[in-house]
């Protein structure tokens, strides 16, 4: 029982999770013509003390995590995208012309504690 | 009373907060000779929908915030350092020699929703 409770309480470490964004769900299908959606992914998980190397942290995140370990009023570092990539989308411009545009920072390629 | 409760519940928007890190508090005074501490700052606050321009977001953060507004299982974007600067510190190397080194990404210069 105690073991089960403990397992439930263990939050997983900062990592990338799947997320498909359907443009019709967020009301963007009126001006984004194609694609109908895309795999955006998202970052989520714990940034525990001490920060492991694979958590792709900055010196500041390491310091903040250390401070949090002695003063919980200061928040832990947060699991966020550290590497993003672009996608191309077709959208309708102000004259309702179809335009192909490259949108930067749309897809999470890597997560880290920042 | 109701007003007071409401005010308490309103979380402030993502911004930089003061944080002075005293190296003796975190046990780093053994190897960091100088300074005794530094102003690190930290980022904290809400990343609300819709993300305002001053919240210095990426396209992915805008998309994730939009998805969160229709599906709360997906977390909101997180308030993190988006601009960091370096500080110089004197530390003792393995031969107990004092070395001056520039440490990157130590001080928060700006925060944003990522």
């Amino acid at each position: 029982q105690a073991k089960h409770k403990q397992r439930k309480r263990l939050k997983s470490s900062c990592k990338r999770h799947p997320l498909y964004v359907d443009f019709s769900d967020v009301g963007w299908n009126d001006w984004i013509v194609a694609p109908p959606g895309y795999h955006a992914f998202y970052c989520h998980g714990e940034c525990p003390f001490p920060l492991a190397d694979h958590l792709n942290s900055t010196n500041h995140a390491i310091v903040q995590t250390l401070v949090n370990s002695v003063n919980s009023k200061i928040p832990k570092a947060c699991c966020v995208p550290t590497e993003l990539s672009a996608i191309s989308m077709l959208y309708l411009d102000e004259n309702e012309k179809v335009v192909l545009k490259n949108y930067q920072d749309m897809v999470v390629e890597g997560c880290g504690c920042r | 009373q109701a007003k007071h409760k409401q005010r308490k519940r309103l979380k402030s928007s993502c911004k930089r907060h003061p944080l002075y890190v005293d190296f003796s508090d975190v046990g780093w005074n053994d190897w960091i000779v100088a300074p005794p501490g530094y102003h690190a700052f930290y980022c904290h606050g809400e990343c609300p929908f819709p993300l305002a321009d001053h919240l210095n977001s990426t396209n992915h953060a805008i998309v994730q915030t939009l998805v969160n507004s229709v599906n709360s299982k997906i977390p909101k974007a997180c308030c993190v350092p988006t601009e960091l600067s370096a500080i110089s510190m004197l530390y003792l190397d393995e031969n107990e020699k004092v070395v001056l080194k520039n440490y990157q990404d130590m001080v928060v210069e700006g925060c944003g929703c990522r």
Epitope: D30, A34, N95, E96, V98 | -
Partner: antibody, heavy 113, light 108 residues
């Protein structure tokens, strides 16, 4: 100079269908949205839907869903609007528009028994 | 759907005067995808303004559009005799695209 030329006036019986054509000449056709708008006598403008010929994607106003079909033939630069189950309230001038700026001359459709 | 309400319904002015037409949306119009049209009897609508403030090709500079979000304005700085007509606003950022009911600009 781009021009949109629509098919001629039609008189239809209630319950029948009408198909109006809109032919573009002198410019780009398939990479713009082609919208269909109607105007009943003495009334305002009413958006029916739009099609993007290059992709074959169409959007319809809820009011016309299931009764209107928008198609486009890229090879002839022609868009079509077919409205079925006609009733007297469908009597109107039907316009096609390329993007926001180029409009056809309009096609009068009269529904009468 | 987004409902557009135009005011006034009728505007009576003289040539040379300034005309201000309003278009209010029931919810925010995405990316300022708002257009203004002029229509004269027996003619197709003519685009004046798109993207809330961009003048269409060949439109005189006495016509200007402004606004964002839910409040938009068409201004005709000095009315010419040929400007008396019906004016419609249209939002095209959210499906279904919708038109206002129109403002009739008549000679006083």
């Amino acid at each position: 100079q781009v021009q949109l030329v629509q098919s001629g006036a039609e008189v239809k019986k209630p319950g029948s269908s009408v198909k109006v054509s809109c032919k573009a000449s002198g410019g780009t056709f398939s990479s713009y949205a082609i919208s269909w708008v109607r105007q009943a006598p003495g009334q305002g403008l009413e958006w029916m839907g739009r099609i993007i010929p290059i992709l074959g994607i169409a959007q319809y106003a809820q009011k016309f869903q299931g009764r209107v079909t928008l198609t486009a033939d890229k090879s002839t630069s022609t868009a079509y609007m077919e409205l079925s189950s006609l009733r007297s309230e469908d009597t109107a001038v039907y316009y096609c528009a390329r993007g926001k700026d180029i409009w056809g001359q309009g096609t009068m459709v009269t529904v009468s028994s | 759907e987004i409902v557009l309400t135009q005011s006034p319904g009728t505007l009576s002015l003289s040539p040379g005067e300034r005309a201000t037409l309003s278009c209010r949306a029931s919810q925010s119009v995405s990316s300022s995808y708002l257009a203004w049209y002029q229509q004269k009897p027996g003619q197709a609508p003519r685009l004046l303004i798109y993207g809330a403030s961009s003048r269409a090709t060949g439109i005189p500079d006495r016509f200007s559009g402004s606004g964002s979000g839910t409040d938009f304005t068409l201004t005709i700085s000095r009315l010419e005799p040929e400007d008396f007509a019906v004016y419609y606003c249209q939002q095209y950022g959210s499906s279904p695209c919708t038109f206002g009911q129109g403002t009739k600009l008549e000679i006083k």
